[in-house]
């Protein structure tokens, strides 16, 4: 028995930040679980982890240097990533493990979300146009 995960196929991070919502076919209310976000086709980089516990505040952390936060819904976890770099444009996969109460459950691998990080470009301001042609 596996949990199904739905993610947006693509998101664009315009201000080097993005909200990625992982929607599960499972209600996380009063469960102990570990939700995580992984970067790359091989999911090699664990970007962010959210630990949920029935009795404690949500624990959110990254061991790989990402600036992340997490928000819990009944059947979803939303990862808020900030300070992303253009070279962090990649595919990101949601993962969920429900530990307690038993039985242990995890998810079928999702299709992932391509996060396209748009760099902050200095655009010419309309108040200070460039030199006009004669």
């Amino acid at each position: 028995n596996k949990i199904l995960v739905k993610q947006s196929p693509m998101l664009v991070a315009y201000d080097n930040a993005v909200n990625l919502s992982c929607k599960y076919s499972y209600n996380l209310f009063s469960r102990e679980f570990r939700a995580s976000l992984h970067k790359g086709l091989d999911s090699a980089v664990e970007v962010c982890v959210v630990y949920g516990n029935y009795s404690q505040q949500l624990q959110v952390y990254s061991k790989t240097g990402f600036n992340c936060d997490g928000k819990l819904g009944n059947e979803s976890v939303t990862f808020y990533l900030q300070n992303l770099y253009v070279n962090q444009t990649d595919i990101y996969f949601c993962k969920i493990e429900v530990m307690y109460p038993p039985p242990y459950l995890d998810n079928e691998k999702s299709n992932g979300t391509i996060i396209h990080v748009k760099g902050k470009h200095l655009c010419p301001s309309p108040l200070f146009p460039g030199p006009s042609k004669p």
């Epitope: 102990e32 493990e97 307690y100 109460p101």
Partner: antibody, heavy 120, light 111 residues
Framework: EVQLVESGGGLVQPGGSLRLSCAAS??????????VSWIRQAPGKGLEWIGE???????YYSPSLKSRVTISRDNSKNTLYLQLNSLRAEDTAVYYC????????????WGQGTLVTVSS | DIQLTQSPSSLSASVGDRVTITCRAS??????????LHWYQQKPGKAPKLLIY???SLQSGVPSRFSGSGSGTDFTLTISSLQPEDFATYYC?????????FGQGTKVEIK
């Protein structure tokens, strides 16, 4: 046949660290459906759960020991490890590894245990 | 944490006696109609051995004189006819929530 064999026990100085091994046979530590826990028993006392590792490699620890404990594994050796730091006399115990199935989480197979004595 | 309280802490019985040990949890350990409460037997110098899982399911290879019952917070281990090899310490354990916890044990001694 499922078997768990612990090793690495002995005399350790207070403040030191221990690293115990649990060699598994008859099943794979990375196969979905089973996990392994570490449990300890102080001389003449009851059983205390330390933590566990799932087939995925995710770990879960007892809050009272979380700051001092690390559970890891080597899939190529099908071996589980327990690292416990900043040892004190109260950590003197027999340390067991025990397997559980995801269905009920009951510990269906146990190792023979390894004794750790913390003393100067 | 879920506290498990066993009673009695020790008991003296004779071969052939019916023995009952109770385990009370500080909160329900039931989920979707299943009780995550297990019973183990431990003999001196040996590792514990699983007898009963999920409150009432007999572990493979365990004699049928052992049985378990109960749900919610109150559970019972019964040995219908005590045998010489049954003199040991018995523990209940919950796996409903982490940290997993054990009862303090019940020592069954020869009268």
């Amino acid at each position: 046949e499922v078997q768990l064999v612990e090793s690495g026990g002995g005399l350790v100085q207070p403040g030191g660290s221990l690293r115990l091994s649990c060699a598994a046979s008859g099943f794979s530590l990375s196969t979905s459906g089973v996990g392994v826990s570490w449990i300890r028993q102080a001389p003449g006392k009851g059983l205390e759960w330390i933590g566990e590792i799932y087939h995925s490699g995710s770990t879960y620890y007892s809050p009272s020991l979380k700051s001092r404990v690390t559970i890891s594994r080597d899939n190529s050796k099908n071996t589980l490890y327990l690292q416990l730091n900043s040892l004190r006399a109260e950590d003197t115990a027999v340390y067991y590894c025990a397997r559980y199935e995801y269905y009920s989480y009951a510990f269906d197979y146990w190792g023979q245990g390894t004794l750790v004595t913390v003393s100067s | 944490d879920i506290q498990l309280t066993q009673s009695p802490s020790s008991l003296s019985a004779s071969v052939g006696d019916r023995v009952t040990i109770t385990c009370r949890a500080s909160q329900s350990v039931d989920f979707h109609g299943k009780s995550f409460l297990h019973w183990y037997q431990q003999k001196p110098g040996k590792a514990p051995k699983l007898l009963i899982y999920a409150a009432s399911s007999l572990q493979s290879g365990v004699p049928s004189r052992f049985s378990g019952s109960g749900s919610g917070t109150d559970f019972t281990l019964t040995i219908s006819s005590l045998q010489p090899e049954d003199f040991a310490t018995y523990y209940c354990q919950q796996s409903y929530r982490s940290p997993r916890t054990f009862g303090q044990g019940t020592k069954v001694e020869i009268k």
